[in-house]
Interface confidence: low
Amino acid sequence: AQEVQQSPHCTTVPVGASVNITCSTSGGLRGIYLRQLGPQPQDIIYYEDGVVPTTDRRFRGRIDFSGSQDNLTITMHRLQLSDTGTYTCQAITEVNVYGSGTLVLVTEEQSQGWHRCSDAPPRASALPAPPTGSALPDPQTASALPDPPAASALP
């Protein structure tokens, strides 16, 4: 069965720093999402070989990619406190397969000692299903937007 290997399990970084998240699969996928989990999960990026990556506007200009969709390293730059959270890779195959998640802890530089990662990987056993529909915010040219749950006029 298809699996997604994701690393690191957890990382603590100061505000303004960068973090690398690597998503590896055995191939045979159509594309890969990086999804920020939480009460309202958000798709951060969609990456597909041969296609210009789509990045959520909150991370526009702060994401770099290296490798291919089968072994993708996503670099998030200029991290902010609000970027703290668990990020999971989702491989789009015949079925959707999730990685184990990466907990990113963004801290004020002087408080790093109080916030450290434990050795245990984040749990990925209860990941939410992708939401449907989308809400339309203020116009922004070619803005890539996550889809919060919302009713849709079409099936």
Epitope: T54, P130, T132, A142, D147
Partner: nanobody, 123 residues
């Protein structure tokens, strides 16, 4: 990056017609679901029409039989022919695409859209 730019909006009297166009660039246009959205001030967003890569269209009930969505994969363009326009069609119209599983309009996640073009229909 993905770029979408709508054109063709304007003012028209009820019963008139307009044709919206949306050239796309920055990605493999033919691989993805496309659609037209609209939103009037103070009103809910409405998906007017979507079109799969095999050119299968889906329409909102409110525009069925009056609007026709089409795509030109060779020229990376999306169109919306709007006939028999009504005052309630007045809105900002947005061209949109959804990144995700290729082909299907049923797996839509990251939405990309243009700045919009205003359509105003007067009595």
């Amino acid at each position: 990056d993905v770029q979408l730019q709508e054109s063709g909006g304007g003012s028209v009297q009820a019963g008139g017609s307009l044709r919206l166009s949306c050239p796309a660039s920055g990605y493999t246009f033919s691989h993805y679901c496309m659609g037209w959205l609209r939103q009037a001030p103070g009103k809910e967003r409405e998906e007017v029409a979507t079109i799969d890569t095999d050119s299968t269209p889906t329409y909102a009930d409110s525009v069925m039989g009056r609007f026709t969505i089409s795509r030109d994969n060779a020229n990376n363009a999306l169109y919306l022919q709007m006939n028999d326009l009504k005052p309630e069609d007045t809105s900002m119209y947005y061209c949109a695409t959804w990144m995700g599983l290729r082909g299907s309009c049923h797996d839509r996640r990251l939405e990309v859209r243009g700045q919009g073009t205003q359509v105003t229909v007067s009595i």
